[in-house]
């Protein structure tokens, strides 16, 4: 699987999950989140050669098409597969509230 | 929706479904499919600016991050959303067989 366990411990050139830290204030302009100040969101990057963790029959066909037509702009793309939530603390007036922000952290990628 | 109805009748620069015809023999090297000789597979292409048909909260966060950090390589990617099957005919010896190949035709795209 193209997950953090594999991708973070290798020098994989193909589609893999990469490290990305997002600072809520600096990178998103969000000032209302109290904790954390930012988080490891990660992102997906890398080429999708034939038969690299391809998602559907279509993406397999497209990767094969790409192999036969190397100059074509039609190619599978490396995108998130497994996403995880992020717990945050914010204030409503003086009262702290804990929320789970769904689909915030990329754990693995796929070629789609 | 970034579907064939919208995308094929517009000059949309952002993520949209594009026309692509795949010839089974020439483009995939498949000689075993009797009918059809090829099909309109289509593909997804185009940038994913903030808030262009973004798929999950993560892809929206990433697009917003990208807006604040224009040089970053982390960005959502235009990939298939709705896929449709393709009926084919092939021969087992002299006997024709009809099969549905699932997930073969792109009908719409999304930014993931």
């Amino acid at each position: 699987a193209l997950d953090t366990n594999y991708c973070f411990s290798s020098t994989e050139k193909n589609c893999c999950v990469r490290q990305l830290y997002i600072d809520f204030r600096k990178d998103l302009g969000w000032k209302w989140i109290h904790e954390p100040k930012g988080y490891h969101a990660n992102f997906c990057l890398g080429p999708c050669p034939y038969i690299w963790s391809l998602d559907t029959q279509y993406s397999k066909v497209l990767a094969l098409y790409n192999q036969h037509n190397p100059g074509a702009s039609a190619a599978p793309c490396c995108v998130p597969q497994a996403l995880e939530p992020l717990p945050i603390v914010y204030y409503v007036g003086r009262k702290p509230k804990v929320e789970q922000l769904s689909n915030m952290i990329v754990r693995s990628c796929k070629c789609s | 929706a970034l579907d064939t109805n919208y995308c094929f009748s517009s000059t949309e620069k952002n993520c949209c479904v594009r026309q692509l015809y795949i010839d089974f023999r020439k483009d995939l090297g498949w000689k075993w499919i009797h009918e059809p000789k090829g099909y309109h597979a289509n593909f997804c292409l185009g940038p994913c600016p903030y808030i262009w048909s973004l798929d999950t909260q993560y892809s929206k966060v990433l697009a917003l991050y990208n807006q604040h950090n224009p040089g970053a390589s982390a960005a959502p990617c235009c990939v298939p959303q709705a896929l449709e099957p393709l009926p084919i005919v092939y021969y087992v010896g002299r006997k024709p067989k009809v099969e549905q190949l699932s997930n073969m035709i792109v009908r719409s795209c999304k930014c993931s």
């Epitope: 998103l28 000032k31 914010y90 | 808030i51 917003l64």
Partner: antibody, heavy 121, light 107 residues
């Protein structure tokens, strides 16, 4: 240009519910708190609650005794306020208003044009 | 809940004079070095518009004839060189404590 356009005036019977919409444009709807404020005829402003559209997080004013429900449709950048068990005291103009962005509870920098809700048997 | 009391309830001012409106909170609205107090104007038949943010910060696009001051529980909105266009109801609002609350307005 930031715009908040609300649905038209409503006339409802006591005990019924009303759902007011607030269609937004010109800003990142997903990532700003949206507040709802009501103003009874000739009276001041009462904060009803707020929603953060990206995750549907909500905070409500207890004064509305669980009668108010806030929702958001991110595909159309539209916020909704539903008020149930309507009574004569709910006759008011209802406003949607965008939060300033620094805090959850905050000042409100853009307002809808208001929707008059009348309760009458 | 924090109760906001505005004085006077109504005010008549001649053009080019200075108007002052007071807002008193039932408890301090200061936290983390900020005063969580804002001012709005609601012109006849219109929605409220933000004038002053965090006690003294002028909202963009608002005339610099408007100014805000104060901290803790006592706040003031001043309008210098008053114009006919300034007619309406002025509201203060706090967001230091849930629920967010408004003053009753000064006409």
């Amino acid at each position: 240009e930031v715009q908040l356009v609300q649905s038209g005036a409503e006339v409802k019977k006591p005990g019924a519910s009303v759902k007011v919409s607030c269609k937004t444009s010109g800003y990142k709807f997903w990532f700003y708190w949206m507040n709802w404020v009501r103003q009874a005829p000739g009276a001041g402003l009462d904060w009803m609650g707020q929603i953060f559209p990206a995750w549907g997080m909500t905070n409500y004013n207890e004064m509305f005794e669980g009668r108010v429900t806030l929702t958001a449709d991110t595909s159309t950048s539209t916020a909704y306020m539903e008020l149930s068990s309507l009574r004569a005291g709910d006759i008011a103009v209802y406003y949607c208003a965008r939060g300033y962005g620094n805090y959850a509870l905050d000042a409100m920098d853009y307002w809808g044009q208001g929707t008059l809700v009348t309760v009458s048997s | 809940d924090i109760v906001m009391t505005q004085t006077p309830p109504s005010l008549s001012v001649s053009p080019r004079e200075t108007a002052s409106i007071s807002c008193r909170a039932s408890e301090s609205v200061d936290s983390y070095g900020n005063s969580f107090m804002h001012w709005y104007l609601q012109k006849p038949g219109q929605s409220p518009q933000l004038l002053i943010y965090l006690a003294s910060n002028l909202e963009s696009g608002v005339s610099d004839r408007f100014s805000g001051s104060g901290s803790g529980t006592d706040f003031t909105l001043r309008i210098s060189r008053v114009e006919a266009n300034d007619t309406g109801v002025y509201y203060c609002q706090q967001n230091d404590e849930d629920p967010l609350s408004f003053g009753q307005g000064t006409k």
